[in-house]
């Protein structure tokens, strides 16, 4: 599998409509919780929790602060921690407890604490529960949690130093935790946890399971350096621990290695960064998407692998176990266990078969079974990805978070759209297209290029958004910027399953937001722009320049995958010649203008889609070079480098074949100058030249003036 290409379009922060939320002096907006039925997004930050309107996160609804007392700060600082940063209260757990309350935990100056947040009054109840085992002591330590039927399942560290890892269930009825033993958890870095409900019609009376994802130090592979291994672990919701062996401990804790590698190159991705569980009506079994980087990542590699949950469950239900054996110098080696396995199967959830054998609860399990799972929590079999290869491998980027949306294109094809954030504050949107990856676009969510810490996807039909949290705030972005594609060609070439061209309105529309039936809409995920209706009209921009000056003719082609070239009087221009230059790889510079330079200039783009090359006329300019008569009174001018003098610009209508403006761009401003009649169209084509006028008759100005033709925006 080849590396993923660059994103086709790059949207700068200012180019697209992004809604932001941040409060002065509040940082680390790393906990996000969405209440779809209330259209409310809850944000956990450092020392604060906010409720904002999920449809417009700039609208704050409530806020509550949970600060650390000076006394606690001082005690924390005495232990060698920073009073300004570490000895504060970082909200790390933000989970729904009931319809009217949230369960919130914070690091609380290295004394983790939890409380209930009443959503009506938006005040804490002051329970001040001990957060040990539910929330890390250190804000820098890894953590994950999920609330299941009113009980919090967490993966974090259990002590001040962060040296005792724990996966626990906080429950008044039956609290459970992992054994503090290397075979169970070996310096894990927790990533994600979620519950997978068993289908009600499940024939074996199975239990719900809670899955944990983490990276840990390998026990089974021995090298000179510590080898990191990505893991999937699971526990059963109905687990009550053992009666004697594994008392108050999981009897169902099993873990396995997650494989994400490129078989042809030996490239192994062994550091897990994030996981997203994709549930969809069309999916019998959930699929989980996992985001990885290699352990030694000096080149900025990231990969996404997708897994069927049934593959993982098969490993836990029927796979072989690993066992530690002592070799010379009391050295421990882990090998496949081939001996007899006790019954009931160690680590299995209590199902109807177990109940039939009178094992109605884990408290009934025989000590042989419990002792076995205590000693053999690691599976020998690994969990392999769908198609045995990554969905995406990207070079020169460090991905941080992932969310995935399953959507249906106009032709009925289902696409899993991956939204992947980077450590530079950007969001990539990617899909698999016939065994290749297409990165539809990159959106710069955060101006300061800071890492995205949290990603959240709304699942409500209609208004769909991605929410991203970082150190400085939260950004809300739509799933697609369809309206930014100003022509049918742009819309089609975007190959965005959310977008289709609407000929009646001559706009690129978001599919899920169109109330009207999809008849007549144009979407071609192959990128075949020939389906677009012929354009009978296009527009020229006419410019008059003075002799000897320099002209810059604009061509705003947004596609990073397109190659731009210029034609003059139907001959291709060579930008390397002394006469011409390219500005920003797209705009044409014509030096030392003479009458011979008058004529029609066309900017064309060439983009390879599959095995076809799509040509587009992006911009057309008519240039007329005139000798400008000297003004009666020569104004005093400051000395500037001039780019030519434009006397007038007017739009002419001309018949063209298949002309089409652009696709989106890196830093170009949008303009609708190509199509007629001129109207607001946020496309990425801009045709007007940037002209510096240094001598203009009838202007009694004493300074240089910069004039631009209107953008028709």
């Amino acid at each position: 599998m080849a590396f993923a290409p660059i994103p086709r379009i790059t949207w700068e922060h200012r180019e697209v409509h992004l809604v932001q939320f941040h409060e002065p002096d509040i940082y680390n907006y790393s906990a996000l919780l969405l209440s779809e039925d209330k259209d409310t997004l809850y944000i956990g930050a450092r020392e604060a929790v906010f409720a904002v309107n999920a449809l417009n996160i700039s609208e704050k609804q409530h806020e509550v602060y949970w600060k650390v007392s000076e006394d606690k700060k001082a005690k924390c600082a005495e232990k060698g921690k920073s009073k300004q940063t570490e000895c504060l209260n970082y909200i790390r757990v933000l989970q729904p407890l009931s319809a009217t309350s949230l369960y919130v935990c914070g690091t609380n100056a290295f004394q983790p604490a939890c409380d209930h947040l009443n959503l009506t009054s938006f005040k804490f109840l002051g329970k001040n529960e001990d957060g040990k085992g539910r929330c890390p002591f250190d804000p820098a330590h890894s953590y994950t949690s999920v609330m299941v039927d009113g009980e919090l399942y967490s993966g974090t560290s259990y002590n001040f130093l962060g040296s005792e890892p724990i996966i626990s269930r906080n429950s008044s009825h039956s609290p459970l935790r992992t054994e503090y033993a290397i075979p169970w958890l070996n310096e894990p870095s927790f990533v994600f946890a979620d519950v997978i409900r068993k289908s009600p019609d499940s024939p074996d009376g199975e239990d719900d399971r809670v899955y944990f994802f983490f990276t840990e130090v390998s026990v089974e592979y021995e090298f000179v350096f510590r080898v990191l291994i990505p893991r999937i672990a699971r526990v059963c919701k109905g687990d009550q621990g053992g009666l004697r062996t594994l008392q108050k401990k999981w009897t169902s804790f099993l873990k396995a290695r997650l494989i994400c590698s490129r078989p042809d190159s030996g490239l192994v991705f062994n550091v897990l960064r994030d996981v997203f569980v994709l549930r969809s009506p069309g999916l019998k079994v959930p699929v989980f998407y996992a985001l990885f980087t290699p352990q030694l990542n000096n080149v900025g590699l990231s990969a996404v692998c997708a897994y069927n949950l049934s593959t993982a469950e098969e490993v836990f239900s029927h796979g072989k176990y690993m066992q530690s054996t002592t070799v010379e110098q009391s050295h421990t080696k882990w090998v496949r266990y081939n001996g007899p396995v006790p019954k009931p199967r160690p680590g299995a959830c209590i199902d109807s078969e177990a109940r039939a054998a009178n094992y109605t609860s884990s408290l009934n399990l025989p000590d042989k079974t419990l002792q076995f799972v205590k000693d053999h929590p690691l599976m020998d079999d690994s969990v392999t990805p769908i198609d045995n290869r990554p969905r995406l491998i990207k070079k020169d980027v460090n991905y941080t978070q992932i969310v995935v949306d399953r959507t249906q294109a106009l032709d009925g094809t289902v696409y899993d759209v991956m939204f992947v954030s980077t450590d530079r504050g950007a969001l990539h949107k990617a899909i698999s297209l016939e065994h290749a990856v297409h990165i539809i676009e990159e959106t710069q969510l955060f101006q300061d290029f800071e890492p995205v810490q949290t990603l959240l996807l709304s699942s409500k039909k209609g208004n769909r958004f991605v929410y991203a949290g970082s150190n400085s705030g939260v950004v809300q972005a739509p799933l697609a910027f369809c309206g930014k594609h100003g022509t049918c060609e742009d819309c089609v070439l975007a190959r965005d399953p959310y977008c289709a061209w609407s000929p009646p309105t001559a706009t690129c529309v978001a599919l899920h937001q169109t109330e009207s039936p999809s008849r007549g809409l144009i979407q071609e995920m192959s990128g075949d722009a020939s389906v677009c209706p012929d354009k009978s009209k296009g527009s020229y921009r006419q410019h008059f320049f003075k002799h000897g000056g320099t002209a810059e003719l604009k061509c705003s082609q947004k596609s990073n995958l397109a190659r731009v070239f210029w034609k003059f009087q139907n001959g291709v221009l060579k930008a390397e010649s002394p006469k011409y230059g390219l500005m920003g790889r797209k705009n044409l510079l014509i030096f030392n203008l003479s009458e011979g330079d008058s004529g029609v200039y066309q900017c064309l783009s060439e983009e390879r889609v599959k095995n076809k090359t799509v040509f587009q006329v992006v911009a057309k300019h008519v240039l007329e070079v005139k000798v400008v008569p000297k003004p009666v009174v020569a104004p005093t001018l400051s000395v500037v480098q001039t780019e030519g003098s434009r006397i007038a610009t007017k739009v002419l209508v001309a018949s063209t074949q298949g002309s089409s403006p652009p696709t989106p761009a890196v830093q170009a401003t949008s303009s609708g100058a190509i199509t007629l009649p001129p109207k607001p169209a946020p496309t990425g084509t801009s045709c007007e030249p940037k002209i510096v006028i240094n001598t203009v008759p009838q202007l009694h100005s004493e300074k240089t003036m910069y004039l631009k033709s209107s953008d028709n925006r």
Epitope: R177, Q240, L243, R244, T245, L246, Q247, K248, A357, N358, Y359, T360, S361, L363, N364, P366, D367, K368
Partner: antibody, heavy 122, light 108 residues
């Protein structure tokens, strides 16, 4: 109704082996999760746990007495037998057998026999 | 360590609350059981698995277990609550049950 009854000698000489039987009714030691355990209590002193046998024939012993104890079961007779070697006067105590309940509400010594006092003396 | 330590005695006036503690290393990792024993009788379970009450045991008996200490609380103590109380736990490191040293509760 669950009943347990301990039987065995009331007087044992030092260095001798003590054999105690626990006869029970109202439950079966073949039922998943069920176990029978032995506890003793020297006069005026605290309870001390001795040994356990469960339905799966797993056996556990007090670490301090492990070398001297043996527990076994005869499910057909509904009986559990404890033997303790090398008796000493400090082993003088009331010896109890008890049923360990199973399942969600289990884990505790649910039903006790009345106990049998064993005196070790020459 | 396989030791569970209890205060030898606790005195309480009728109607008052008696708290009996049981200390042991990382006790909250283990289930704690509480037994009441009256003279000449075998013990009777009053609390199992830290805080659960068997049927037939009055509501005034409650249990908790946190850190290194488990507590049996008898609220509105009555004269008939006068007895010896033992805590008990399973010590997984040595695979054995351990009883506490016992607390004599006297109702004044």
């Amino acid at each position: 109704q669950v009943t347990l009854k301990e039987s065995g000698p009331t007087l044992v000489k030092p260095t001798q082996t003590l054999t105690l039987a626990c006869s029970f009714s109202g439950f079966s030691l073949t039922t998943t999760g069920v176990a029978v355990t032995w506890i003793r209590q020297p006069p005026g002193k605290a309870l001390e746990w001795l040994a356990l046998i469960d339905w799966d024939d797993d056996k556990y012993y007090s670490t301090s007495l492990k070398t001297r104890l043996t527990i076994s079961k005869d499910t057909s007779k509904n009986q559990v037998v404890l033997t303790m070697t090398n008796m000493d006067p400090v082993d003088t105590a009331t010896y109890y057998c008890a049923r360990i309940a199973s399942g969600d509400s289990g884990g505790y010594f649910a039903d006790w026999g009345q106990g049998t006092l064993v005196t070790v003396s020459s | 360590s396989s030791e569970l330590t209890q205060a030898p005695s606790v005195s309480v006036s009728p109607g008052q609350t008696a708290s009996i503690t049981c200390s042991g290393d990382k006790l909250d990792d283990k289930y704690v059981y509480w037994y009441q024993q009256k003279p000449g009788q075998p013990p009777v379970l009053v609390i199992y698995r830290d805080n659960k009450r068997p049927s037939g045991i009055p509501e005034r008996f409650s249990g908790s277990n946190s850190g290194n200490t488990a507590t049996l609380t008898i609220s509105a103590t009555q004269a008939l609550d006068e007895a010896d109380y033992y805590c008990q736990a399973w010590e997984s490191s040595s695979d054995q049950y351990v009883f506490g040293t016992g607390t004599k509760v006297t109702v004044l």
